[in-house]
């Protein structure tokens, strides 16, 4: 791995908690200000593997609201606008980090948590298993 | 919003830092143990809008490695295995939270940061039709 020289201006940490417990500034720095806001707003409808977005809310988690994609069809939309069941709509999933309040209901103490979310859907060719 | 009753066992917080700076336990709780590890391992190749995965590494960020999808084609793969340029392969993007070391090179002090990542690609129909 890459060794990072320690900055002498770092906050102190007690050995018993270090490196498991860290200080995190929740004032979010958003690196996405240069992106096009239209970037994917209508893909869920225009895709050959369209999806619906479901709101998942949990006040004990940060961010408290996460949107989950659910593919609308088992197959994919063909050029005629019909569902082609020779193809499969599948969710594209990603592991993301969230903060979970720990102990519960504490406003300033969290634990890092990994969750799997479906971001959208894509159309794939099925793997056909032939039975002799 | 939902008001959460405060747990009397919460760590203390100084008003000057609260609620911007919080304590976070980095021992990750993984909620994904029941997921199929193969869940989307080959979708990038089997999709009608296939993609390559690009490793993005930054030692000042947690997680330090993020995989970014890059769509392989301008169009989408049709039933004959050729690229159909009347369709578009587009990246499905998601804003995710990461931790950025702040001040730089500090092992136990971070700031929350939002970044936009491309998770995979999907095939969409254009809404503006080409005039020859």
């Amino acid at each position: 791995g890459i060794t990072i020289p320690r900055n002498p201006g770092c906050p102190n940490s007690e050995d018993k908690n270090f490196p498991r417990t860290v200080m995190v500034n929740l004032n979010i720095h958003n690196r996405n200000t240069n992106t096009n806001p239209k970037r994917s707003s209508d893909y869920y409808n225009r895709s050959t593997s369209p999806w619906n977005l479901h709101r998942n809310e949990d006040p004990e988690r940060y961010p408290s609201v996460i949107w989950e994609a659910k593919c609308r069809h088992l197959g994919c939309i063909n050029a005629d606008g019909n569902v082609d069941y020779h193809m499969n709509s599948v969710p594209i999933q990603q592991e993301i980090l969230v903060l979970r309040r720990e102990p519960p209901h504490c406003p300033n103490s969290f634990r890092l948590e990994k969750i799997l979310v479906s971001v959208g859907c894509t159309c794939v060719t099925p793997i056909v298993h032939h039975v002799a | 919003g939902i008001t959460i009753p405060r747990n009397p066992g919460c760590p203390n917080s100084e008003d000057k830092n609260f609620p911007r700076t919080v304590m976070v336990n980095l021992n990750i709780h993984n909620r994904n143990t029941n997921t199929n590890p193969k869940r989307s391992s080959d979708y990038y190749n089997r999709s009608t809008s296939p993609w390559n995965l690009h490793r993005n590494e930054d030692p000042e960020r947690y997680p330090s490695v993020i995989w970014e999808a890059k769509c392989r084609h301008l169009g989408c793969i049709n039933a004959d295995g050729n690229v159909d340029y009347h369709m578009n392969s587009v990246p499905i993007q998601q804003e995710i939270l990461v931790l950025r070391r702040e001040p730089p090179h500090c092992p136990n002090s971070f700031r929350l940061e939002k970044i936009l990542v491309s998770v995979g690609c999907t095939c969409v129909t254009p809404i503006v039709h080409h005039v020859a």
Partner: nanobody, 125 residues
């Protein structure tokens, strides 16, 4: 913001070759499909070539097919336009652009949001 800077233009004789470069700063170029467009005096800007995010797929306008190719080096954050068998009618200002939306096909100019200032290519007979 993404800043795009073209270079490599110049004066060349008919039948000659040039390689145009488009270097990006700001967000990494691999986040976008890229395109080259050109604008001749008194004419509208027209599509020349496009390349996918990964660089695996390219498309060129029919009037430059077999003469122009597009490539990219994501590690260097640079896109290239390789031009050979140049003709006087290829004289124009060549612009590179980053595609940020997908309303039309790869050659739909309005889908490209980030543009360079352009580099002049002059082909003499």
């Amino acid at each position: 913001e993404v800043q795009l800077v073209e270079s490599g233009g110049g004066l060349v004789q008919a039948g000659g070759s040039l390689r145009l470069s488009c270097a990006a700063s700001g967000r990494t170029l691999y986040s976008y499909p890229m395109g080259w467009f050109r604008q001749a005096p008194g004419k509208e800007r027209e599509f020349v070539a496009a390349i996918s995010m990964s660089g695996d797929d390219t498309a060129v306008a029919t009037f430059v097919k077999g003469r122009f190719t597009i490539s990219r080096d994501n590690a260097r954050n640079t896109v290239y336009l390789h031009m050979s068998s140049l003709k006087p009618e290829d004289t124009a200002v060549y612009h590179c652009a980053a595609r940020t939306s997908y309303s039309g096909r790869y050659d739909y100019i309005d889908d490209y949001s980030y543009w360079g200032q352009g580099t002049q290519v002059t082909v003499s007979s």
